[in-house]
């Protein structure tokens, strides 16, 4: 060292800005200066390292007025590469001077070209777009050639401007862009061996997603309680924030503030700042603001704090003291206007006992009682009990709930018949509607007349949108009304109104309606009043069982309000299956006031016409085909035979006599009478009985004597029998004359 002029900065034994040495060598570095000084070493060199020795500054140089110190590093390693600085200790005289000297020492090692190797896990490097980014792959020798790559296969080439290489610092990217986000690696090949150190760039963002304060505003406290406000800032993963509070006691530092980061979320960071004031006073009331800042981004959140000297309760009706709702509502809220602090205990009573114990449908929500699925059972008196035990404060208030019910007609709910009933012509009928509702419904009876046109078949003759007329007992609309009456009755524990309409004489078809209404709504029940002159609305008749050669006459009568599409069919069984055969040459059905008639006549039947004949009609309401069957057995023809032959007979003059000629045969034989071979005709004094089977002679005379013959005839043949009638006694004819 020379002993020249005063040293403004310490002087190092190694000249220049850098020095290259080989790993394993010893580094000697002396520092001489005008004042006491200290050493600053690279972070990779530990002051506790046994290989490092630093002599304390001791007198040296010009008359021992200078200070010298020696740094010795035995067996230097690659990671000892870095900036070594000798610095004057701070004194009042040296403050203004640049009081240090530095040299960058490269400890070159072919086996460790990079000072820091990040192979197992890449080193995280934070970046902000538009700012300088350094990929700190510092090397142990300034001669090492380093390449910067981005996974998977991009190379970031230094251009001397945007990307530059500095062996002391690494790659310097002047203004980072999204292109530098990713897994970057520095590669160096030394003596044919590839070395890689990895870095993961992490974009620093300023995105504040949300700021909240818990508990929510307003926060109410009693004097002496503890205020705790938790401000939560949610940000993107790569965002850092500064959090601060503005509050009434900030100047006197009334609050203690703690901060923490929650990193458990996979896509966000959550920052917490917790403000706490013990023993709040009225001076602590006011606005508390949590301020969150990240770069140029800023968000804040306010909450107001109220401090009360003592507790209080005030309760009023939110609506009227008497409230109304409707049965069947999904829910009803009984609500009171309550101002209280601290939060009181709440109990709701229904008719004097705890509501929530009465039914699981009662839910307490704040100062409201929510009644789910309202029923008539929910009508009653509801009392809210409010209590703050520690303040010995208690209040209550009662509201009455009326549950209205839309009218219901009981008969509508019971399963109705698929098709309407029929009312026999001329009959007396009692029609009933049992009604329930709150308030009690008003019941009226109405009459809907039907189109009454029997000139043709009508299936839509009676529709419900016809004009309707309100009925009273004196109405002469439709059928004669005997009475309309109402009575109250208890059914299944509830008061119901039974309204009865008595029809005196069922003559006119139509629709009777009972209509029940109250302020909640209206309900109507339609009673189709179909009058029938046919028993059960469907009747089949056979004039008589025909014999071969006779005519088959069948008649089908159906109620025209209930049936349509009337037809005769013949049922035949083939292979255990019943087949329906339509019958041709059917007559047209005739429509009367109440019914439709379809006659079937089959002339000159044969045995083959025997079978099951059915009248089929379609029920207008159900669409179902209804069959009414009748068995027809065509009787085989049989020649006549007499059950008893005539026998000779004597009769007194002026007496009377009966000759009997009972014959059987199929078809029933025709009986003809002869006297002395002359056909007998009915005339005064001679009477032919039923089917000509008897011959009755009144006041017998001599002329009546003779041979009487009866002849029974049908298609199969004839049979006859004769007898002689003798008249006894003389004639007094001459006397009479």
């Amino acid at each position: 060292y020379g002993s020249g002029s005063k040293l403004k900065v310490p002087e190092l034994s190694l000249k220049g800005t850098q020095h290259v040495m080989q790993a394993g060598q010893t580094l000697f570095l002396k520092c001489r200066g005008e004042a006491a000084h200290s050493w600053s070493l690279p972070t990779t060199v530990s002051q506790e390292d046994k290989r490092l020795s630093i002599t304390p500054p001791s007198a040296c140089g010009r008359d021992n007025r200078q200070f010298c110190s020696t740094l010795t590093l035995d067996t230097a390693q690659a990671n000892h590469t870095g900036l070594y600085t000798c610095r004057y200790l701070p004194t009042s005289t040296s403050k203004k001077k640049k009081a240090e000297s530095s040299i960058y020492i490269f400890v070159s090692d072919a086996g460790s070209p990079f000072i820091e190797m990040h192979t197992d896990i890449p080193k995280l490097v934070h970046m902000t777009e538009g700012r300088q980014l350094i990929i700190p792959c510092r090397v142990t020798s300034p001669n090492v050639t380093v390449t910067l790559k981005k996974f998977p296969f991009d190379t970031l080439t230094p251009d001397g401007q945007r990307i530059t290489w500095d062996s002391r610092r690494g790659f310097i990217i002047a203004n980072a862009t999204y292109k530098e986000i990713g897994l970057l690696n520095c590669e160096a090949t030394v003596n044919g061996h590839l070395y890689q150190t990895n870095y993961l760039t992490h974009r620093q963002t300023n995105t504040i997603l949300d700021v909240q304060i818990r508990p929510p505003s307003p926060v109410r406290l009693l004097h002496g309680q503890t205020l705790v406000l938790n401000c939560t800032a949610t940000t993107e993963l790569n965002t850092r924030v500064q959090m601060s509070w503005n509050y009434p006691g900030k100047a006197t530092k009334r609050a203690s503030i703690r901060q923490r980061i929650d990193r458990s979320h996979s896509h966000n960071n959550v920052f917490h700042s917790v403000l706490k004031i013990n023993n709040v006073e009225s001076r602590d009331k006011g606005l508390y603001t949590c301020r969150v800042k990240s770069g140029s981004s800023f968000q804040s959140f306010n909450t107001s704090v109220h401090v009360y000297e003592k507790g209080f309760i005030s309760v009023k009706h939110r609506k009227q003291p008497v409230q109304e709702t409707t049965a069947g509502r999904r829910s009803y809220r009984l609500s009171m206007k309550v101002k209280a602090f601290p939060s009181p205990e709440i109990v709701w009573l229904k008719d004097g006992s705890p509501a929530t114990l009465k039914s699981a449908r009662y839910l307490v929500h704040g100062y409201s009682l929510i009644i789910k699925d309202v029923t008539t059972e929910d009508a009653g008196d509801y009392t809210i009990l409010l209590g703050i035990k520690q303040s010995r404060l208690f209040k209550n208030l009662t509201a009455t709930l009326i549950v209205n019910v839309k009218p219901q007609i009981y008969e509508k709910s019971v399963s109705s018949l698929p098709s309407p009933p029929l009312y026999p012509l001329g009959s007396r009928q009692v029609l009933t509607c049992t009604v329930y509702g709150i308030p009690r419904p008003t019941i009226t009876w109405l009459w809907h007349p039907c189109h009454h046109n029997h000139s043709k078949e009508r299936y839509d003759f009676c529709t419900e949108n016809e004009e309707s007329f309100i009925l009273d007992p004196s109405s002469n609309l439709g059928n004669r009304i005997e009475s309309i009456s109402q009575r109250m009755t208890v059914i299944e524990g509830t008061n119901k109104t039974v309204s009865t309409l008595v029809v005196a004489d069922s003559q006119t078809p139509g629709i009777y309606s009972c209509r029940a209404f109250n302020k909640i709504g209206t309900v109507e029940r339609n009673i189709k009043f179909y009058v029938t002159d046919v028993p059960n609305g469907f009747h089949v008749s056979l004039e008589k069982m025909p014999a071969e050669g006779e005519d088959l006459k069948l008649s089908c009568v159906v109620n025209k309000f209930l049936y349509r599409d009337i037809t005769w069919i013949l049922l035949r069984t083939v292979n255990n299956r019943t087949m329906h055969h339509s019958i041709s040459k059917q007559k047209m059905a005739t429509t009367q006031d109440y019914s439709i008639t379809l006659n079937l006549v089959i002339k000159n039947v044969s045995l083959e016409d025997s079978g099951t004949y059915a009248c089929r009609a379609r029920n207008i309401y159900t669409g179902e085909d209804i069959l009414r069957k009748t068995e027809v057995l065509v009787r085989d023809s049989e020649a006549p035979h007499l059950l008893q032959n005539l026998s000779d007979y004597e009769v007194s003059i002026s007496g009377s006599t009966t000759l009997d000629c009972q014959a059987r045969g199929v078809p029933a034989p025709q009986i003809t009478w002869f006297k002395n071979n002359h056909k007998i005709q009915q005339e005064p004094g001679i009477i032919l009985g039923p089917g000509n089977s008897t011959l009755f002679i009144e006041r017998v005379t001599e002329e009546d004597e003779g041979v009487y013959r009866c002849r029974a005839t049908n298609q199969k043949g004839a049979v006859e029998s004769a007898a002689y009638l003798t008249v006894q006694g003389t004639s007094d004819k001459s006397n009479l004359e």
């Epitope: 197992d120 896990i121 996974f151 998977p152 296969f153 999204y178 986000i181 990713g182 897994l183 992490h202």
Partner: antibody
């Protein structure tokens, strides 16, 4: 929510072509490399192609080189693979994958789209 | 034939520890990071391990990865029935200039 959704699969005859698309949402698509990986029925995963974040560098598996082309449109947040001269052995479920966080492996996968090459 | 070699199957009973190996070469495993993927039946693969040994958030600490030279391994401790799946190792291959995968290991949880 971070998502990849593949589309364009279907039945094609040998020698035919298909273009598969992969639409990304919920992350900064233009920042990361994209990959296509396939899986034949009952088989393992097979890398098909990779494209860098800007779409300037691509790499294809030897089995598909010259027949398949990977591309991307950062304005549409979509990656594509154009498949020509298809063969029966190309039948597979095709997945697109990306990296969206700090892993730089395939940390986000689509549900896959099925390609069947058959006459 | 896969570039990385894995055993085709592995098994264990609930609570046991199982290890799945993956071997490669200097152009892939030795010079690059190893990733492990889990594929449950009928679903897309899911990243299980990255940078040889790191777990993404949401992956239980029962799963661990390691790498040594040209080999890597996945260890699952405290085996659970829901761990039954196919496991694949994957890495970048410098000579191929692309990703390579192992053939997959089917893990069966017995009993």
């Amino acid at each position: 929510e971070v998502q990849l959704l593949e589309s364009g699969g279907g039945l094609v005859q040998p020698g035919g072509s298909l273009r598969l698309s992969c639409e990304a949402s919920g992350f900064d698509f233009s920042t990361y490399a994209m990959n296509w990986v396939r899986q034949a029925p009952g088989k393992g995963l097979e890398w098909v192609a990779t494209i860098n974040s800007e779409g300037t560098i691509t790499s294809h598996a030897p089995a598909v080189k010259g027949r398949f082309t990977i591309s991307r449109d950062n304005s549409k947040n979509t990656a594509y693979v154009q498949m020509n001269s298809l063969r029966a052995e190309d039948s597979a479920v095709y997945y697109c994958s990306s990296t969206t966080g700090t892993t730089h492996g395939m940390d986000v996968w689509g549900r896959g789209t099925t390609v069947t090459v058959s006459s | 034939q896969s570039v990385l070699t894995q055993p085709p199957s592995a098994s264990g009973t609930p609570g046991q520890r199982v290890t799945i190996s993956c071997s490669g070469s200097s152009s892939n495993i030795q010079n690059n990071y190893v990733y492990w993927y889990q594929q449950l039946p009928g679903t897309a693969p899911k990243l299980l391990i990255y940078f040889n040994s790191q777990r993404p958030s949401g992956v239980p600490d029962r799963f661990s990865g390691s790498k040594s030279g040209t080999s890597a391994s996945l260890a699952i401790s405290g085996l659970q029935s829901e761990d039954e799946a196919d496991y694949y190792c994957g890495t970048w291959d410098d000579s191929l200039n692309g990703w390579v995968f192992g053939g997959g290991t089917k893990l069966t949880v017995l009993g």
